[in-house]
């Protein structure tokens, strides 16, 4: 297992609709064709997996059907979007990137993006 640098923004504020987007960028040492991206949430010293996707370079990220995450890739950047967030989901969201193929296997873990979420009042006749 070889180390790899992963960069992500320090802070992101979720929208009033509970949507947060951030970029996860990795310094690929070689020409990876298969990449796995995992979003982890750290809160109260507990780490849980929020979502994960494996993709072939140049293709769309495919998350599980019931995932709260969506994403697109462009070169060594992954644009991640998490939806349905509420105040209790505030926490540090860590981007983990694995270069699965071809060998050698590389692993990179970002420092995390602190996502802040508020629970806004619903506006009349609209979805916020």
């Amino acid at each position: 297992c070889k180390a790899m640098h992963v960069a992500q923004p320090a802070v992101v504020l979720a929208s009033s609709r509970g949507i947060a987007s951030f970029v996860c960028e990795y310094a690929s040492p070689g020409k990876a064709t298969e990449v796995r991206v995992t979003v982890l949430r750290q809160a109260d010293s507990q780490v849980t997996e929020v979502c994960a996707a494996t993709y072939m370079m140049g293709n769309e990220l495919t998350f599980l059907d019931d995932s709260i995450c969506t994403g697109t890739s462009s070169g060594n950047q992954v644009n991640l979007t998490i939806q349905g967030l509420r105040a209790m989901d505030t926490g540090l969201y860590i981007c983990k990137v694995e270069l699965m193929y071809p060998p050698p296997y590389y692993l990179g873990i970002g420092n995390g993006t602190q996502i802040y979420v508020i629970d806004p009042e619903p506006c009349p006749d609209s979805d916020f």
């Epitope: 949430r41 059907d65 209790m88």
Partner: antibody, heavy 123, light 107 residues
Framework: QVQLVQSGAEVKKPGASVKVSCKAS????????MHWVRQAPGQGLEWMGI????????IYAQKFQGRVTMTRDTSTSTVYMELSGLISEDTAVYYC????????????????WGQGTLVTVSS | DIQLTQSPSSLSASVGDRVTITCRVS??????LNWYRQKPGEIPKLLIY???SLQSGVPSRFSGSGSGTDFTLTISSLQPEDIATYYC?????????FGQGTKLEIK
Amino acid sequence: QVQLVQSGAEVKKPGASVKVSCKASGYTFTSYYMHWVRQAPGQGLEWMGIVNPSGGTSIYAQKFQGRVTMTRDTSTSTVYMELSGLISEDTAVYYCARDPPITLVRGAPFDYWGQGTLVTVSS
Amino acid sequence: DIQLTQSPSSLSASVGDRVTITCRVSQDISRLLNWYRQKPGEIPKLLIYRASSLQSGVPSRFSGSGSGTDFTLTISSLQPEDIATYYCQRTYSAPYTFGQGTKLEIK
């Protein structure tokens, strides 16, 4: 095991207020939102509002704004729903239901409900 | 306000039939939708969450699909105990509106 136990049935006069309680046990009270939903006799489900037991903040459906207050007591793991200015159309069964933050991957929203509290408004 | 419209409002089917209930939402809610079954005199029971995830303990004959504004609950083989009213609900954000319900009866 997870339990949401609500207070007993109430009979109120028009114009009065009612306060229904929902006592939670079997999980970390402050880690889950709590909703209030009501159901009038022979009618569908109607969402009333949500309270965050961690911070105590609440959000109410527009229909109940100014008439409903949702609070919580963390020392007893209990949430309360108070509805004022009662009218006959408020006659319904009132339910509480818990709801985890979405990033609690193993959690499903509205997975546990209280047994319901019948509130009858009659002169 | 955000509207959830279920169809049909009532239906009658035979034991063993495949039954489909639809829920249309007036705004895009991605996949954040629940389905419930409520038997007469009982509390609502969660069947499906996030549009397609089967709640623990729910029989596999129940399935959900859809995304955005159009969602479907399917019962692959109707059983006598499925006599109930079924509700969809958006869990995207407040207000957590319910559909008006679909009353299912056995022929």
